[in-house]
C-alpha cells in the first residue's frame, strides 16, 4: 500500500479469484483514543471500533472511502483504491491501446519545435468518475524538472457503438536547451483513477523523436508567363524554432489531381519555393520535416491550382 | 579549416558534408524510429558516447561568441563515432551487406573530422570504450544503438554548420 495523495491510498493486489489480498491497517487521524467507530462509503454499518481498523482487501467491495467517527462527528477519511496485477501485468483497463507506432501505446506525445514544450494525449471509452494526474521529468535517476498542466478533455468521437474520449495535457521542460543533443529521455507518467480502480501509464521519449512541425504557412501560387508552370512559395510555420538558419526544415511539394487514383507528382526541396506544373482541377500541397533528423512530417498545407 | 588557435572552418564544405552524414545515418538505419531501443537494457553500451550538451556553445549565440568550443566537441564526437564504425562491432558477424551505407558513413565521418582538424593540429579526443559483444545479436543491437545516437549527434552538427555557413562565413 502507498499514498497517492493526502488521504488517498493505493493497494496493490495480485488479481485472481481467491487471492489472499492485502492486510491494511487504517489509522484515524485524531488525538482521540476512545469511542471511535469506522464506516465504509455511504453505509452506516459499523465495521469496527478503535483508533485503528484492520481490513483484508481482496476485491473492489473492500475498497472505497473509510471514515472514522466519534459521537456523530467525522474525524478523518481514507480512500482506498485498487491497482490490479493480472497475470503478472499491471492492468490497463482505463485507457485504449492506440497501437501506433506499436502495440501497448497508451500515451502519444508530439512537439511542434525544440523549445521543450510538448503535448501528450490518450483515449478512453469511460465518460464518468474519471480523473487523471500527470507528472514528467527529464531522466529518472536524477530527474530534471518538467511542468505539466492539468489534463483536459480535448475531443469526443463516435466509434461504432462507442463514444471515445480524448484527453490531452501540455508540458514544458523547465530549463530547455533547444540546441543540445538530448542524452536523457523525457519521462511522462499519468495516474488514472476510475471509480476505485487505479492505473498508471508511462511514456519515455526524446523531444527530437516526437517533433512534428505545423504545416507551412502562406502557401501561394504565382503563374509563370507563357507556361503551365507555377511558382509555389510558402513560409516556415510561426511555431517552428528559430533562427531558421539553425533549425532548418525540408519540404515536400505534391501536385494531386481531383481523383485519388491519379498519379501524384512530388518534389523535395530545402528552399521555400518550387516550380511545378499545375494541372486543371489539381491541388498543390506542401508539408515540412526537420531537415537533419527524420521525425514526423507536418500535415499538408494545400491550395487549389485554379 | 578550424585551427585550434581559432581560425574559421570551411563552413560551406562542412555544411554539405554534415548534411550528407545525416542522410547516410538515416539510410544506414531507417527503421530506427519504429524500434524502442531503450527497452533493450541500456547497460553501459552507449552511455559513454560524447553528446553535444548545453554548455558546449553549439547554440546560435555560443557559435557567434566563440565557435571553437563547439567545433572541438563536434570533432571529438566525429572521431569517437569514426572509431566505433571501424571497430569489431561493425566489422564482425553478422556481416554488413556489400551495399551498406555504413562504409560511406565511416568515410564521411573521417572526412568531416579532417576538414575540422587538418594534419598537425591536435584537439584531445575521447577514449572509446572497449565494447566487444560476444553474441551476434548483441552486436546487432549495439549497431542499432550506435547509429541511433549518431543520428542525433550529426543532426546537431549539421545545424551548427548550416548556421555557420549562413551567418559566420567570411
Amino acid at each position: 500500500i502507498w499514498e497517492l495523495k493526502k488521504d488517498v491510498y493505493v493497494v496493490e493486489l495480485d488479481w485472481y479469484p481467491d487471492a489472499p489480498g492485502e492486510m491494511v491497517v487504517l489509522t484515524c487521524d485524531t488525538p482521540e483514543e476512545d469511542g471511535i467507530t469506522w464506516t465504509l462509503d455511504q453505509s452506516s454499518e459499523v465495521l469496527g471500533s478503535g483508533k485503528t481498523l484492520t481490513i483484508q482487501v481482496k476485491e473492489f467491495g473492500d475498497a472505497g472511502q473509510y471514515t472514522c467517527h466519534k459521537g456523530g462527528e467525522v474525524l478523518s477519511h481514507s480512500l482506498l483504491l485498487l491497482h490490479k496485477k493480472e497475470d503478472g501485468i499491471w492492468s490497463t483497463d482505463i485507457l485504449k491501446d492506440q497501437k501506433e507506432p506499436k502495440n501497448k501505446t497508451f500515451l502519444r506525445c508530439e512537439a511542434k519545435n525544440y523549445s521543450g514544450r510538448f503535448t501528450c494525449w490518450w483515449l478512453t471509452t469511460i465518460s464518468t468518475d474519471l480523473t487523471f494526474s500527470v507528472k514528467s521529468s527529464r531522466g529518472s535517476s536524477d530527474p530534471q524538472g518538467v511542468t505539466c498542466g492539468a489534463a483536459t478533455l480535448s475531443a469526443e468521437r463516435v466509434r461504432g457503438d462507442n463514444k471515445e474520449y480524448e484527453y490531452s495535457v501540455e508540458c514544458q521542460e523547465d530549463s530547455a536547451c533547444p540546441a543540445a543533443e538530448e542524452s536523457l529521455p523525457i519521462e511522462v507518467m499519468v495516474d488514472a483513477v476510475h471509480k476505485l480502480k487505479y492505473e498508471n501509464y508511462t511514456s519515455s521519449f526524446f523531444i527530437r523523436d516526437i517533433i512534428k512541425p505545423d504545416p507551412p504557412k502562406n502557401l501561394q501560387l504565382k503563374p509563370l508567363k507563357n507556361s503551365r508552370q507555377v511558382e509555389v512559395s510558402w513560409e516556415y510555420p510561426d511555431t517552428w524554432s528559430t533562427p531558421h538558419s539553425y533549425f532548418s526544415l525540408t519540404f515536400c511539394v505534391q501536385v494531386q489531381g481531383k481523383s485519388k487514383r491519379e498519379k501524384k507528382d512530388r518534389v523535395f526541396t530545402d528552399k521555400t519555393s518550387a516550380t511545378v506544373i499545375c494541372r486543371k482541377n489539381a491541388s498543390i500541397s506542401v508539408r515540412a520535416q526537420d531537415r537533419y533528423y527524420s521525425s514526423s512530417w507536418s500535415e499538408w498545407a494545400s491550395v487549389p491550382c485554379s | 579549416r578550424a585551427v585550434p588557435g581559432g581560425s574559421s572552418p570551411a563552413w560551406t564544405q562542412c555544411q554539405q558534408l554534415s548534411q550528407k552524414l545525416c542522410t547516410l545515418a538515416w539510410s544506414a538505419h531507417p527503421l530506427v524510429g519504429h524500434m524502442d531501443l531503450r527497452e533493450e537494457g541500456d547497460e553501459e553500451t552507449t552511455n559513454d558516447v560524447p553528446h553535444i550538451q548545453c554548455g558546449d556553445g553549439c547554440d546560435p549565440q555560443g557559435l557567434r561568441d566563440n565557435s571553437q568550443f563547439c567545433l572541438q566537441r563536434i570533432h571529438q564526437g566525429l572521431i569517437f563515432y569514426e572509431k566505433l564504425l571501424g571497430s569489431d562491432i561493425f566489422t564482425g558477424e553478422p556481416s554488413l551487406l556489400p551495399d551498406s551505407p555504413v562504409g560511406q558513413l565511416h568515410a564521411s565521418l573521417l572526412g568531416l573530422s579532417q576538414l575540422l582538424q587538418p594534419e598537425g593540429h591536435h584537439w584531445e579526443t575521447q577514449q572509446i570504450p572497449s565494447l566487444s559483444p560476444s553474441q551476434p545479436w548483441q552486436r546487432l543491437l549495439l549497431r542499432f544503438k550506435i547509429l541511433r545516437s549518431l543520428q542525433a549527434f550529426v543532426a546537431v552538427a549539421a545545424r551548427v554548420f548550416a548556421h555557420g555557413a549562413a551567418t559566420l562565413s567570411p
Partner: antibody, heavy 114, light 107 residues
Framework: EVQLLESGGGLVQPGGSLRLSCAAS????????MGWVRQAPGKGLEWVSY????????SYADSVKGRFTISRDNSKNTLYLQMNSLRAEDTAVYYC???????WGQGTLVTVSS | DIQMTQSPATLSVSPGETATLSCWAS??????LAWYQQKPGQAPRLLIY???TRATGVPARFSGSGSRTEFTLTISGLQSEDFAVYYC?????????FGPGTTVDIK
C-alpha cells in the same frame, strides 16, 4: 468459494463442431480474465485460448487459430469455447481457468474420432 | 514461442526429504512463472506465482526461487499428499507455455 464447471464435451467426428461452456460462481466473474487449457490423454498441458474481462481482447494458440472462438457472457457468468473443424489431435480434457493464474475447473473430455 | 524445460523428468524421494525441481525458459520470462501440482484424475492446482509467491492455502513447505530463465521449486519435508506431477508455466508472453512436467514419486 470459487467454482468452475465445464460442460459440452463428448465424442465428435473429425471436421465436426462442439461448444464448451464453463459456469463460474463464487467470485465476480466480470472482473477477471479467463482461459481454456487442454491436456491430451497421458500428455502435458497446453494453453488454447485466453480472454480479457470485458471480452474485447482474445488470444489463441497457433494450433487452434481460425478454428476455435473464445467468448464470455458476463451477465450469465459463463465462458464459452466454440470449436469448429475439429481434428483427432484436438482430443483432450479441456479445462476452464481464471486467467493464467488461479483456479481450474475439473475439465470436460472432448474426443474427436471417426 | 517460449520453450519451457523441466528437470528431472522423474524424481524419487522418501517422505520427509526435500525435493528440488528445476525449470528453464528459452528466453527471459522475468518473474512471470507459476508452478502447478497435478494429481491423477484431478485438475492442476496453482502452488506458486511470480516465481516466489505462494498461492492461497499452499503450505509453507513449498517455496519457489529464480528469475529470468532459471527457476526452482523446493518441497521441504515431503508429505504423502505431495507425490504428484509438477508443471512450471511462463505467463510473460502469449502463448503461455508449460514445461513437460516432473513426476515426484515415492522412493
Amino acid at each position: 468459494e470459487v467454482q468452475l464447471l465445464e460442460s459440452g464435451g463428448g465424442l465428435v467426428q473429425p471436421g465436426g463442431s462442439l461448444r464448451l461452456s464453463c459456469a463460474a460462481s463464487g467470485f465476480t466473474f466480470s472482473h477477471y480474465r479467463m482461459g481454456w487449457v487442454r491436456q491430451a490423454p497421458g500428455k502435458g498441458l497446453e494453453w488454447v485460448s485466453y480472454i480479457y474481462s470485458s471480452g474485447g481482447l482474445t488470444s489463441y494458440a497457433d494450433s487452434v487459430k481460425g478454428r476455435f472462438t473464445i467468448s464470455r457472457d458476463n451477465s450469465k457468468n459463463t465462458l464459452y469455447l466454440q470449436m469448429n473443424s475439429l481434428r483427432a489431435e484436438d482430443t483432450a480434457v479441456y479445462y476452464c481457468t481464471t486467467g493464467a493464474l488461479g483456479q481450474w475447473g475439473q475439465g470436460t473430455l472432448v474426443t474427436v474420432s471417426s | 514461442d517460449i520453450q519451457m524445460t523441466q528437470s528431472p523428468a522423474t524424481l524419487s524421494v522418501s517422505p520427509g526429504e526435500t525435493a528440488t525441481l528445476s525449470c528453464w525458459a528459452s528466453q527471459s520470462v522475468k518473474s512471470n512463472l507459476a508452478w502447478y501440482q497435478q494429481k491423477p484424475g484431478q485438475a492442476p492446482r496453482l502452488l506458486i506465482y511470480g516465481a516466489t509467491t505462494r498461492a492461497t492455502g499452499v503450505p509453507a513447505r513449498f517455496s519457489g526461487s529464480g528469475s529470468r530463465t532459471e527457476f526452482t521449486l523446493t518441497i521441504s519435508g515431503l508429505q504423502s499428499e505431495d507425490f504428484a506431477v509438477y508443471y512450471c508455466q511462463q505467463y510473460d508472453v502469449w502463448p503461455f507455455t508449460f514445461g513437460p512436467g516432473t513426476t515426484v514419486d515415492i522412493k
